[in-house]
């Protein structure tokens, strides 16, 4: 029995809902009471939710997963997981039998963007060309791990003195601070930009000097 | 009330080193600049260095920098200023000054500690 | 390095003379950070102008500061005893910051 699945990962955000599809081609005079379909985690074996004898068995994943009854005499055997979370990341493996059996995996990559970053400057008071400072880019409640930049005004990227944390909330969100530590001159503009490579998705932020008196408020 | 207390006088050997303090208070330390002045006797002011106690980044005047150290130590508000190598030039009246144009406008220097170089 | 010179060194004025000190840059400064101290023998030294022409807290309105790039001033309209000090100029616009040499204004 050929059970088909999407070759690229299910990309959910955190918090939406998502569908894992899985189909299978029934034969002339399919019956459900025929159907046995049980979604698992790949890994762990752990059963997710299943279907037999003519009756959807319910989930075992935290009641967060259901079928399309509907839609399965016709062969989709797709799965709904609501309020996707990070620990929902992995391979999903659905298993069709009716007289034959055929299975299949599919991934699900969860992601949640960052937000905009707000930049802090230290020291932030009386400062003069030829100090040396350290801007903080700090950006919240991202996954998965993001990807940080530093530019100049120019265009030109800044990679040395570049230190980049990032720590996991309770939620497996990643919240990411990255300090550039650079020598100021007369004039000019750091920017960051904190890309979720999932996504795709980028944050920017940036910090102006403009001569002095050299203070700088965040951005808005 | 910002206040700035320096430590006492200094009488060293050519070639020795001195480590001087001002203890500051009435003030977020971490979040301001404090400076190092040198007077020479009858003579005018020559600005040595100044540290940010926040990130202690500092910035030295050429002519002391290698000979010069600023630290800070955030645990007591006191910052420091380390001569090394001293010679008969050094001697003299070192000013520890807190200056800033940020947000309000204030300066206020410290007593001042007399350091002597002499055999 | 900026250059601050002062003129003249040592000046001597009556009581009720006006007096007027100059304070020469070598390169332009940010006015703003272009202040004045006074010092006497024995003490530390004491703003009296910030930012050009601003008199600090306490000193007598008899004082006033002006100027800009290259010149710099600081004026008394009518000389008193008590003004008999040092006065410093000071630029903390551009590294390295620097002092003028002084000037020793004594009461005749």
């Known amino acids: 029995l050929e059970v088909q699945v999407p070759e690229d990962p299910v990309v959910a955000l955190v918090g939406t809902d998502a569908t894992l599809c899985c189909s299978f081609s029934p034969e002339p005079g399919f019956s459900l009471a025929q159907l046995n379909l049980i979604w698992q985690l790949t890994d762990t074996k752990q059963l997710v939710h299943s279907f037999a004898e003519g009756q959807d068995q319910g989930s075992a994943y935290a009641n967060r997963t259901a079928l399309f009854p509907d839609l399965l005499a016709q062969g989709n055997a797709s799965l709904r997981l609501q309020r996707v979370r990070v620990a929902d990341e992995g391979s999903f493996t659905c298993f069709v039998s009716i007289r034959d059996f055929g299975s299949a995996a599919v991934s699900l990559q969860v992601a949640a963007p960052y937000s905009k970053p707000s930049m802090t400057l230290e020291p932030n008071k009386d400062l003069r060309p030829g100090d040396t400072v350290t801007i903080t880019c700090s950006s919240y409640r991202g996954y998965p791990e993001a990807e940080v930049f530093w530019q100049d005004g120019q265009g030109v990227p800044l990679t040395g003195n570049v230190t980049t944390s990032q720590m996991a909330n309770e939620q497996g969100l990643f919240d990411v601070h990255s300090v550039l530590r650079v020598v100021l001159g007369a004039n000019g503009t750091y920017s960051c930009l904190v890309r979720n490579p999932v996504l795709q998705q980028d944050a920017h932020g940036s910090v102006t000097i403009t001569g002095q008196p050299m203070t700088f408020p965040p951005e808005a | 009330e910002v206040q700035l207390q320096q430590s006492g006088a200094e009488l060293v050997r050519p070639g020795a080193s001195v480590k001087l303090s001002c203890k500051t208070s009435?003030?977020?330390?971490?979040?301001?600049?404090i400076h190092w002045i040198k007077q020479r006797s009858g003579q005018g002011l020559e600005w040595i260095a100044r540290?940010?106690?926040?990130?202690?980044?500092?910035f030295y005047n050429e002519k002391f920098k290698g000979r010069a150290t600023l630290t800070a130590d955030k645990s007591s508000s006191t910052v420091y200023l380390q001569l090394n190598s001293l010679k008969s030039e050094d001697s003299a009246v070192y000013f520890c000054h807190f200056i800033t144009a940020s947000d309000w406008y204030f300066d206020v220097w410290g007593a001042g500690t007399t350091v002597t170089v002499s055999s | 390095d900026i250059v601050l010179t002062q003129s003249p060194a040592i000046m001597s004025a009556s009581p009720g003379e006006k007096v007027t000190l100059t304070c020469s840059v070598s390169s332009s400064v940010n006015s703003n950070y272009l202040y004045w101290y006074q010092q006497k023998p024995g003490s530390s030294p004491k703003l009296w102008i910030y930012?050009?022409?601003n008199l600090a807290s306490g000193v007598p309105a008899r004082f006033s500061g002006s100027g800009s790039g290259p010149s710099y001033s600081l004026t008394i309209s009518s000389m008193e005893a008590e003004d008999a000090a040092s006065y410093f100029c000071y630029q903390w616009s551009s590294y390295p910051f620097t002092f003028g040499s002084g000037t020793k204004l004594e009461i005749k």
């Open positions: 009435g003030y977020i330390f971490t979040s301001y600049w």
């Open positions: 540290i940010y106690p926040g990130t202690d980044s500092t």
């Open positions: 930012g050009t022409s």
